[in-house]
């Protein structure tokens, strides 16, 4: 499998056949699927060096592994977006052979000295082809050439098989399988052959080629494939529920920040709440994990403006969960990514010397913001596309905090929206959905390059919409919802996670 | 065809020096460990160190008894594998033969004829 | 380092007659589900001959009445039925540790 260690180094190889028999359309069809792959690994912050042929009678190297920009996953996507079928179009023979002998010669090195780390560094050849060459003879004797060059399957102790990777995609309107099969790698328990079909769902077919074991620690990671759970899909996702002995339960969200914490709303919890009667549960386990302590905010406090006739104040409402023991991350437990740390900088391929500010203009300019937050719906987690109105529909949306229950004698409304807040919900640009009772706590979260970032956390909301947790289809124009903007409580999360490896800015 | 022919054997005095080669031909000689192997006379075989093939760095392993005195080289141009010995004693008095250890299965399954190193004063 | 001890030292018999040498292991030589134990023959003044790799793996060019046997630690070399030419010292070698180490030999000679 494609190995994807951030540590490590990588050479992909894209080996895409323009012959005639493979036809305009597979061809650009292929095309999007390598582009998606290049996103894919991306995603991963793993900067593997790519190598780029086309071929018919010649191959072209459209990319060589040496070049300076062969590892920046934006120009290699240029490139390939600018290939046409129509390159190979006056020699259109199908050579795959010279094709794998181009790609031989990026892997070799000039008179045989091997340069410092060769044997660290894993090759993986995704070859899109009909299989059906017509000229320049068996490909696969190339293959025996780069496992040789590679020293792969000589040393019994040690056969490097992991070091070589070949991919295979039929792709066309004929399909010699035979040929394809023989030409990629053949390994126990993996996939390597792959069919035009496959391509309908990438997401199923790169799940199938990714050894992510490396990276399980990476925030905001997520798989999409069909035979995912929600987990797969949200695996920073916790379920919070506080037993209060007769008074029954309450029902909160949260999000997996690191191995040992959960941020959450400190609303969720009252003073008088043991940390036995709080359960919380991750990656859809039925086992509940125990909890250290609960650790508010310290300038979170309820009834601060009882006396000034503000019967619930959600300032600073944030919470951090500390778990007993250290959780044990997979693909469906992983950590959200934080602001104005170095995990966010990776995710978002922002230089190393981003600072917190530079985070905060990416992730919340002066704009409405695409956003999303986590619901449980009928027992399934679903996402729910929102935006933040941080441009000029910000202070409307704010100014409709007066028609919350409590809030419609409030004089001016700074004094129960602080700039802790963010604001969603309303009509426009689009009709936002909305958070229920049993949302709170939970990530407000910007997704950006293939990454899953929270912002805020769930505080509260102006109207109930969710009468008997079922959302109402038809919902006033001033149901907002509103958030902890994480960038306004950094000191304290910066404080409480210091020692969790975050790298906070 | 697989061949090793070692050379500079000879008569040296205890705590001098000796230089032995091992050249080789028919096979890629930086995909193979070379390992040194000696026999004194009337006695058994002893392993003297290797070369590893180019994965590993060409990086080099000895026995304890030579540790520190012998140096294992090789000139992968030339498909020449070296044995530089210095503070020769009298009991490194043996045949020293040149072998190809096959990574394939970590035996060795070529050997030079040996050439004869005696220490004595 | 992992000692390897052959026996016996001298193994006399008649050409036709069936030959057993073992071969401990101070220690395991097994890893990854292979035994890196290999047997060589050597006659006077010749340099030695690689007869079994892998503990049971005949050499291309050895005659089938060769085989070897064993895993860990006990191993043996085994010629079925002995001719003339198979009169010579059978060393062990281990290459599963570094240093490589070498039995003492077992000098097969004709009764």
């Known amino acids: 499998k494609i190995v994807l260690d951030p540590s490590g180094s990588m050479n992909i190889y894209l080996v895409l056949d323009g012959s005639d028999s493979i036809g305009a359309s597979n061809f650009t069809g292929a095309k999007k699927c390598l582009v998606n792959l290049i996103e894919k690994v991306a995603s991963y912050g793993v900067k593997p060096r790519y190598g780029l042929v086309t071929y018919a009678t010649y191959p072209k190297i459209w990319v060589k592994v040496s070049e300076a920009d062969s590892s920046n996953a934006d120009w290699v996507t240029k490139q390939l977006n600018e290939i046409n079928y129509e390159d190979h179009k006056l020699k259109s023979g199908t050579n795959t052979k010279k094709a794998l002998q181009a790609v031989y010669s990026m892997m070799s090195w000039p008179d045989d000295v091997p340069p410092e780390g060769w044997n660290r560094t894993r090759h993986v050849i995704i070859l899109m082809t009909d299989g059906l060459h017509n000229m320049g003879g068996d490909p696969i004797t190339v293959i025996d050439e780069i496992r040789d060059l590679l020293y792969i399957g000589k040393d019994r102790k040690n056969p490097r098989e992991d070091y070589l990777d070949v991919y295979v995609f039929g792709v066309g309107p004929l399909v010699n399988q035979v040929n394809i099969n023989a030409l990629a790698s053949k390994k126990d328990n993996e996939q390597h052959v792959f069919k035009v079909k496959d391509m309908e769902n990438l997401e199923d077919v790169f799940y199938q080629m990714i050894d992510e074991s490396q990276s399980l620690s990476l925030c905001g990671m997520v798989w999409e494939h069909r035979k995912g759970t929600d987990y797969h899909k949200q695996p920073w996702q916790a379920k919070i529920s506080v037993i209060r002995p007769s008074k029954g339960h309450e029902s909160c969200m949260g999000a997996v920040v690191s191995e040992y914490f959960v941020l959450t709303a400190a609303h969720c919890f009252t003073v008088d709440d043991k940390e036995h009667s709080i359960k919380v549960s991750v990656g859809g386990e039925k086992r509940d994990l125990e909890i250290e302590v609960v650790l508010f905010h310290p300038n979170y406090n309820i009834n601060g403006k009882k006396e000034a006739g503000i019967p619930e104040f959600y300032d600073y409402d944030v919470a951090l969960i500390k778990l007993k023991n250290k959780l044990k991350y997979g693909q469906t437990i992983r950590p959200i990514c934080l602001p104005c740390t170095e995990g966010t900088t990776r995710a978002l391929r922002l230089p190393p010397t981003t600072t917190c500010q530079q985070q905060k203009e990416e992730l919340l300019p002066a704009q409405d913001i695409k956003a999303l937050f986590v619901s449980e719906e009928e027992k399934k987690l679903t996402r729910k596309e929102v935006y933040i109105k941080n441009g000029d529909k910000k202070g409307s949306c704010e100014r409709d905090a007066q028609y919350a229950p409590g809030y419609d004698k409030v004089k001016d409304i700074s004094e129960v929206v602080t700039p802790r807040f963010l604001c969603t919900g309303g009509v426009s640009p689009y009709a936002d959905p909305n958070t229920c009772r049993g949302d709170s706590g939970g990530p407000l979260i910007v997704h950006k390059r293939s990454r899953f970032i929270q912002v805020g956390v769930i505080s509260w909301g102006v109207v109930d919409v969710c009468k008997n947790q079922k959302r109402q289809k038809q919902v006033p124009a001033h149901a907002r919802d509103f958030h902890i903007n994480l960038f306004q409580v950094l000191p304290w999360l910066k404080e409480k996670l210091q020692d969790e490896d975050l790298g906070f800015l | 065809e697989v061949q090793l022919v070692e050379s500079g054997g000879g008569l040296v005095q205890p705590g001098g020096s000796l230089r032995l080669s091992c050249a080789t031909s028919g096979f890629t000689f930086r995909d193979y460990y070379m390992s040194w192997v000696r026999q004194a006379p009337g006695k058994g075989l002893e392993w003297v160190g290797f070369s590893r093939h180019r994965v590993y760095g060409y990086t080099t392993e000895y026995a304890a008894s030579v540790k520190g005195r012998f140096t294992i080289s090789r000139d992968n141009s030339k498909n020449t594998l070296y044995l530089q010995m210095n503070s020769l004693k009298t009991e490194d008095t043996a045949v020293y033969y040149c072998?190809?250890?096959?990574?394939?299965?970590?035996?060795?399954?070529?050997w030079g004829q040996g050439t004869l190193v005696t220490v004595s004063s | 380092e992992i000692v390897l001890t052959q026996s016996p030292a001298t193994l006399s018999l008649s050409p036709g007659e069936r030959a057993t040498l073992s071969c401990k292991a101070s220690?395991?030589?097994?890893?990854?589900?292979?035994?890196?134990m290999n047997w060589y023959q050597q006659k006077p003044g010749q340099a030695p001959r690689l007869l079994i790799y892998?503990?049971?793996n005949l050499e291309s060019g050895i005659p089938a009445r060769f085989s070897g046997s064993g895993s860990g630690t006990d191993f043996t070399l085994t010629i079925s039925s002995l001719e003339p030419e198979d009169f010579a010292v059978y060393y062990c070698?281990?290459?599963?540790?570094?240093?490589?180490?070498f039995g003492q030999g077992t000098k097969l000679e004709i009764k």
């Open positions: 072998a190809r250890d096959n990574p394939g299965y970590y035996a060795m399954d070529y």
């Open positions: 220690q395991s030589v097994d890893y990854d589900g292979d035994s890196y």
């Open positions: 892998a503990a049971s």
């Open positions: 070698q281990q290459s599963n540790a570094d240093p490589y180490t």
